[in-house]
Interface confidence: low
């Protein structure tokens, strides 16, 4: 009966860096001739291993093929890389000049499992303000097989992406994923996180996460109020300028007297609120006896390179 070449596994999956065995058994020792392993078919097929004296780095025979009774022509490929993916054929030749191919196994497809890179989440270059819609993009690369799941979350709530693409669309040794999600910012988002979660067969149910802290992408402008306290003595008036619920910390506060700069504050001791925003209070003591006329005091707050917010307060002359 005609020799049969049997490759029992139709496919094997192996993690990048690991080794895999490709099994091949023959049903007969005859006719005499070499057995060779190829990746691919046709003119472009690549010789992977030949059971002769040639040396093939990373590929070794599993059993002693020199024994006359041996019918096992399995090979082990070590330190597998994504480039090793493909269909491998165990091929029997009949000795001659040249050798002629007489039978091939059905092929074993090698799927190389490569882990996705840790997801990287990028957001807008400029900070957004509450009620503004901003886009975040998550990217991960180098994974195989192509099947992958990507989910977005904000504070534990799943978000629906605008689009998710896996490239390339055709067969390849490894793949990349990119996904974009739109988030509507709100003033409570300073402590919020946007999380991109990637699940893949190689990750053993422990998805990879990329995190964007919304504190890096949001600007909450302060509410500014100027109030006059009850005078502590006949000659003194206390003015308070309060900047409330702002983020980030970058704040400059200037007191003006009838339009002229009177004092520059560079806040040091900011109060942090539970929602992550800050408050700052500046006290300004006015010597009322020095003012016969009404005086307009201005508190000017510059926050995070934004246009100044000004609040005026008139202190009546004595």
């Amino acid at each position: 009966t005609e020799v049969k070449v049997i490759q029992p596994e139709k496919s094997v999956s192996v993690a990048a860096g690991d080794s895999t065995v490709l099994n091949c058994t023959l049903t007969s020792l005859l006719p005499v001739g070499p057995i060779r392993w190829y990746r691919g078919v046709g003119q472009s097929r690549q010789l992977i291993y030949s059971f002769t004296t040639e040396h093939f780095p990373r590929v070794t025979n599993v059993s002693d093929a020199t024994k006359r009774s041996n019918l096992d022509f399995s090979i082990r490929i070590s330190n597998v890389t994504p480039e090793d993916a493909g269909t491998y054929y165990c091929v029997k030749f009949q000795r001659g000049s040249p050798d002629t191919e007489i039978q091939s196994g059905g092929g074993t497809e090698v799927y190389v499992l490569a882990k996705p890179s840790p997801p990287e989440v990028s957001g807008p270059a400029d900070r957004g303000i509450p009620d503004q819609k901003v886009n975040f993009t998550c990217k991960s690369h180098g994974f195989s097989p192509r099947n992958i799941t990507l989910k977005w979350f904000k504070d534990g709530q799943e978000l629906h992406p605008l689009e998710t693409t896996v490239n390339p669309s055709g067969k390849n040794v490894s793949y990349n994923i990119s996904s974009t999600v739109r988030v509507v910012l709100n003033s409570m988002d300073v402590n919020s996180k946007v999380i991109c979660e990637v699940a893949h067969i190689t990750l053993d149910r422990s998805p990879l996460r990329g995190i964007a802290n919304l504190s890096n992408f949001i600007r909450v402008s302060p509410t500014v109020k100027v109030t006059q306290q009850s005078p502590t003595s006949m000659n003194q008036v206390n003015l308070t300028c309060r900047a409330e619920r702002f983020y980030p910390e970058d704040l400059q506060l200037i007191w003006l007297e009838n339009g002229n700069v009177s004092r520059n504050d560079t806040p040091k001791n900011l109060t942090k609120n539970t929602d992550g925003t800050y408050n700052y209070t500046s006290l300004f003591l006015v010597n009322s006896s020095a003012h016969r006329e009404d005086v307009v005091f201005t508190c000017q707050v510059k926050h995070d390179q934004q246009p100044a917010i000004t609040r005026n307060h008139t202190v009546l002359g004595f």
Epitope: T1, K4, I6, P8, E9, K10, T25, T27, D72
Partner: antibody
């Protein structure tokens, strides 16, 4: 025409080893081109592949049973056999042997033998 | 392991009806799928191999199609002798796994 026939005890005590043999008639087990398989079916349930052997050596087991299963072939008797150790009531099933062609499925089956695990 | 999900789990149809059973694999198995028929108290019988090839001696009213993850088994005109449970089985990845079965009855 190839035929398969399972044989072995119908009752096995818990913790003991279940041993079954499949005799091939009408063809040689060592003619090549086929795997010789064991499959079981729990009462009223679906089919579970246990493992398979090729006459010249390669053996494949279901990982869920691998620690307890041994499949062997005896070409001189044209038989292959199954041993399942440390059995429990959960191993009560109809056990089938079958011939599997490389690309033609399990085309020949034995009629099946019922094995009950009970003390 | 590859999970094979068969649906429906049971169906009732009239003689002459066209009956369709689907089988879904948990990942791509190319066309490495077989279909079997099992009558009560009997061993399974191979009907279709490699997803669409009719096994020797099987009537042409049985057919199979599909590739990748989704497969279909069809009986073009149900006959009384077709009362049985039908199973799909993948052989792309070890261990070979079967679907849960579809019990076909006559109305």
């Amino acid at each position: 025409q190839v035929q398969l026939q399972e044989s072995g005890p119908g009752l096995v005590k818990p913790s003991q080893t279940l041993s079954l043999t499949c005799t091939v008639s009408g063809g040689s087990i060592s003619s090549g081109g086929y795997y010789w398989s064991w499959i079981r079916q729990h009462p009223g349930k679906g089919l579970e592949w246990i493992g398979a052997i090729y006459y010249s050596g390669p053996i494949y087991y279901n990982p869920s049973l691998k620690s307890r299963v041994t499949i062997s072939v005896d070409t001189s008797k044209n038989q292959f056999s199954l041993k399942l150790s440390s059995v429990t009531a959960a191993d009560t099933a109809v056990y089938y042997c079958a011939r599997e062609g490389y690309h033609s499925g399990m085309d020949v089956w034995g009629q099946g033998t019922t094995v009950t695990v009970s003390s | 392991d590859i999970q094979m999900t068969q649906s429906p789990s049971s169906l009732s149809a009239s003689v002459g009806d066209r009956v369709t059973i689907t089988c879904q694999a948990s990942q791509d198995i190319s066309n490495y799928l077989n279909w079997y028929q099992q009558k009560p108290g009997k061993a399974p019988k191979l009907l279709i191999y490699d997803a669409s090839n009719l096994a020797t001696g099987v009537p042409s009213r049985f057919s199979g199609s599909g590739s990748g993850t989704d497969f279909t088994f069809t009986i073009s005109s149900l006959q009384p002798e077709d009362i049985a449970t039908y199973y799909c089985q993948q052989f792309a990845y070890l261990p070979w796994t079967f679907g849960g079965g579809t019990k076909v009855e006559i109305k």
